[in-house]
C-alpha cells in the first residue's frame, strides 16, 4: 500500500510540475516555485532539461537562469549544456521526499 | 507578503562612503536577483546592479569602480556601498527584487533618500 | 548601453480617455524584455508589465503592452482617478539595464 500510495504522489508532483512549467514565467508565483525548486535541488525540467524546449513561452535553446550552475542573469539563453543542471526534478525531488518523509 | 526595506543614514559627506542595507521580509532570498536602483531629477531611474544568493554580481558599467553590492543569507539581507561619493550621488535609492524568470522589478522597497553634503 | 526615449512626455486626457504612451530604444531589446512601471509622487514605481505584453500580478485588465524589437507601447484603455501618475519603460535585456525619462499622465 505503501509503494502504491508513493507511487501515486509521485505520479501527481509530476504532473503539478509541468502544469506549472507551462505557465513559467507567466505566472509570478509560479516562476518563483519552478526557481526555487531548480536552484535548491540543481535540477532542470521534469524527467530532464530538453523539456523546456516543449514550452511556448520559452524561446528556442532556452531554459530559465535557476537551471544553471553559475546563476547570472541570461545564463540560460543559448545555454552550453555542460553549464546546466541536466537532472530532471521530478526524479530528484522524489528522491529527496523517498529519503526524508 | 514579500516586503523590502532600505536603512542606512540619510546624509553622507562628499568622498566618504554612502552604505545601504534591504531587509527582505516575508520570504526567502534565495532563487531571485535582489537590485539596487537609484533616482534623481537631474539622472532618472538608473539600475545600480545585483547580486544573487550565490555571490554572483552584475553592476552598471558607469558606477562599477565605485560599486559593491553583498548578501547576507542568514539576515535575509543585502547591501551596497558606493565609495568616494560626491553630490552626484544624491538620490533617493531603491532597492527591488527580480525573478529568475526575468519577471522585472516586481517587488520594490519604499526608498530612501540619501543626501551627499558637507 | 540601450537608451529609451518616452512620447509624449506629458498626456493630458479626461478619466474614461485611452491613453497610448510610446517607447522607442536605440536598439532592439534583447528577447522583448521590457517593462512597464508606474509611480506616484512620494511612492516606488509599481511594475504593470513585464516581457512588453505580461501583465504583472493585480495589475488590472485596462493596461496593456504591446511591441517588439525597438517599438513598445503601453495602452490603458479607458482611465481612472488613480492612473494618473508618471509611467516609465525599462528595458532588461542587455546590461547595463536602462529605463526612459518618464511620460506624465495628468488630468485634462
Known amino acids: 500500500a505503501g509503494y502504491v500510495f508513493r507511487d501515486k504522489v509521485m505520479s501527481e508532483f509530476n504532473n503539478n510540475f509541468r502544469q506549472q512549467m507551462e505557465n513559467y514565467p507567466k505566472n509570478n508565483h509560479t516562476a518563483s516555485i519552478l526557481d526555487r525548486m531548480q536552484a535548491d535541488f540543481k535540477c532542470c525540467g521534469a524527467a530532464n532539461y530538453t523539456d523546456w524546449e516543449k514550452i511556448p513561452s520559452m524561446s528556442k535553446n532556452r531554459v530559465p537562469d535557476s537551471c544553471c550552475i553559475n546563476v547570472t542573469v541570461g545564463c540560460g539563453i543559448n545555454f552550453n549544456e555542460k553549464a546546466i543542471h541536466k537532472e530532471g526534478c521530478v526524479e530528484k525531488i522524489g528522491g529527496w521526499l523517498r529519503k526524508n518523509v | 507578503q514579500v516586503q523590502l526595506q532600505e536603512s542606512g543614514p540619510g546624509l553622507v559627506k562628499p568622498s566618504e562612503t554612502l552604505s545601504l542595507t534591504c531587509t527582505v521580509s516575508?520570504?526567502?532570498?534565495?532563487?531571485?536577483?535582489w537590485n539596487w536602483i537609484r533616482q534623481s531629477p537631474e539622472k532618472g531611474l538608473e539600475w545600480i546592479g545585483y547580486i544573487y544568493i550565490s555571490g554572483t554580481t552584475n553592476y552598471n558599467p558607469s558606477l562599477k569602480s565605485r560599486v559593491t553590492i553583498s548578501v547576507d543569507t542568514f539576515k535575509n539581507q543585502f547591501s551596497l556601498k558606493l565609495n568616494s561619493v560626491t553630490a552626484a550621488d544624491t538620490a533617493v535609492y531603491y532597492c527591488?527584487?527580480?525573478?529568475?524568470?526575468?519577471?522585472?522589478?516586481?517587488?520594490w522597497g519604499q526608498g530612501t533618500m540619501v543626501t551627499v553634503s558637507s | 548601453e540601450i537608451v529609451l526615449t518616452q512620447s509624449p512626455g506629458t498626456l493630458s486626457l479626461s478619466p474614461g480617455e485611452r491613453a497610448t504612451l510610446s517607447c522607442r530604444a536605440s536598439?532592439?531589446?534583447?528577447?522583448?524584455?521590457l517593462a512597464w512601471y508606474q509611480q506616484k509622487p512620494g511612492q516606488a514605481p509599481r511594475l504593470l508589465i513585464y516581457g512588453a505584453s505580461s501583465r504583472a500580478t493585480g495589475i488590472p485588465d485596462r493596461f496593456s503592452g504591446s511591441g517588439s524589437g525597438t517599438d513598445f507601447t503601453l495602452t490603458i484603455s479607458r482611465l481612472e482617478p488613480e492612473d494618473f501618475a508618471v509611467y516609465y519603460c525599462q528595458q532588461y535585456g542587455s546590461s547595463p539595464w536602462t529605463f526612459g525619462q518618464g511620460t506624465k499622465v495628468e488630468i485634462k
Open positions: 527591488a527584487r527580480m525573478g529568475l524568470g526575468r519577471e522585472a522589478f516586481d517587488i
Open positions: 536598439q532592439s531589446v534583447s528577447n522583448n524584455y
Open positions: 516575508g520570504g526567502s532570498i534565495s532563487s531571485y536577483y
